[in-house]
């Protein structure tokens, strides 16, 4: 805490500029008007203040805005953001994606801090949903972000945002997350034609129900075994041999190598031997 002392004659800051780096902490406290600082926040980043000096500037802003900083100040915090605590950030109302990007940029190269996590949380909650632009931004800064969200959090992703999802964004998602994302993807891509639709929906199929797999089997999609192995066991079990053959197309021969693994193993056990024999793969039910 800096003592309240009168500003020495001639030292009152008229603007935020380089001369302030020579001010002692108490001089900054006494001679820099908080309102001036707030209106000229964009200049702070261009000035090589010490951490101690930044502490003083933060203290001045805290006094000016005890209920939390306005977005006009937040957007220009720059490196001062690294001084904020999660408690500070919980007072903010960040609505602009530009503000979010500016602060994530400041933190780039650092680990995701509790401050950044709080900022993202506040931003997403403030928006009420994870819209496409936000998702784009977060996955660009933090690959894997999507799969770090719980199924409950993912439920706030609107179908339109699914267009921002790349296959690699789903690499670490588990089946329960795909259960939530799949219906959104199905809705998002519903107006695409067969082959284009399959390319887009493929990464989400770990959440697909039986009826959708049956429908896909009628569209000559040639699903690869890696995708088939990620399907829900309960969704695969009711499929007939003919449907699986159509679903996999030329990849059906790969069933032999996977016959002891789920979901293939459990599916084989559900089929009539006569039907399995039609595949000519030597599968034993």
């Amino acid at each position: 805490e800096v003592e309240k002392t009168a500003c020495p004659s001639g030292k009152k800051a008229r603007e935020i500029d380089e001369s302030l780096i020579f001010y002692k902490k108490w001089e900054l406290e006494a001679c820099v008007d908080a309102a001036l600082l707030a209106t000229q926040m964009d200049r702070v980043n261009a000035i090589p203040f010490t951490y101690e000096q930044l502490d003083v500037l933060k203290h001045k802003l805290d006094e000016l805005y005890p209920q939390g900083y306005p977005e006009s100040v937040i957007q220009h915090l720059g490196y001062l953001f690294l001084k904020m605590s999660p408690e500070d950030i919980r007072k903010w109302n960040v609505t602009s994606l530009e503000t979010l990007k500016a602060l994530l940029e400041v933190n780039k190269g650092h680990e995701m801090s509790p401050q950044v996590a709080t900022l993202i949380d506040r931003f997403v909650k403030g928006r009420g949903q994870l819209d496409k632009d936000t998702l784009d931004t977060l996955t660009a800064f933090y690959p894997g972000y999507l799969c770090s969200l719980s199924p409950e959090e993912l439920s706030s992703v609107p179908p339109s945002s699914i267009w921002a999802v790349r296959p690699q964004d789903l690499d670490t998602c588990d089946p329960r997350q795909l259960d939530v994302l799949y219906p959104k993807a199905r809705l998002a891509f519903q107006n695409m034609n067969g082959s284009e639709y399959f390319v887009k929906i493929q990464s989400f199929l770990g959440g697909a129900p039986t009826e959708d797999l049956k429908a896909l089997s009628q569209q000559n999609v040639s699903m690869d075994l890696a995708t088939f192995m990620k399907l829900r066991t309960d969704a695969v079990l009711p499929l007939t041999v003919a449907e699986v053959q159509k679903l996999l197309g030329p990849h059906v021969e790969g069933l032999k190598a996977e016959e002891r693994h789920r979901p293939v193993r459990d599916w084989i056990l559900r089929q009539r031997q006569d039907d399995l024999d039609t595949l000519g793969l030597g599968l034993q039910g």
Epitope: E111, G144, S150, P151, T172
Partner: nanobody
Framework: EVQLAESGGGSVQAGGSLRLSCAAS????????MRWYRQAPGNVREFVSA???????SYTDSVKGRFTISQDNAKNTVYLQMNSLQPEDTAMYYC???????????????WGQGTQVTVSS
């Protein structure tokens, strides 16, 4: 370097209980999702349960109501309480952590070495 150490596996009669632990180390704060997977002999690794960064949990259908996942953030440890165990639960159980926004060596996800659970009828 991120490391995961599982413990708590063992042999138990059907209907019995076990509590698995997975202690994570080698990273500071970031968004983390902890998951348990299992792999029976000759089978692929399958998802069992997860605890997400917001503290909510999820389970595969076959273990719902029998298994409970929880975590101790102070110790960076996740637990899997397994009750009413059945022979079908016999497998090697693996802990996995996914880190987002961490500067750590190697790439997420990270896997533990596994702990064996054997349930006899």
């Amino acid at each position: 370097e991120v490391q995961l150490a599982e413990s708590g596996g063992g042999s138990v009669q059907a209907g019995g209980s076990l509590r698995l632990s997975c202690a994570a180390s080698g990273y500071s704060y970031c968004r983390s999702t902890m998951r348990w997977y299992r792999q029976a002999p000759g089978n692929v690794r399958e998802f069992v349960s997860a605890i997400y960064s917001d503290g909510t949990t999820s389970y595969t259908d076959s273990v719902k109501g029998r298994f409970t996942i929880s975590q101790d953030n102070a110790k960076n440890t996740v637990y899997l309480q397994m009750n009413s165990l059945q022979p079908e639960d016999t497998a090697m159980y693996y802990c996995r952590i996914d880190l987002v926004g961490c500067n750590v060596a190697g790439g997420s996800p990270y896997w533990g070495q596994g702990t064996q659970v054997t349930v006899s009828s």
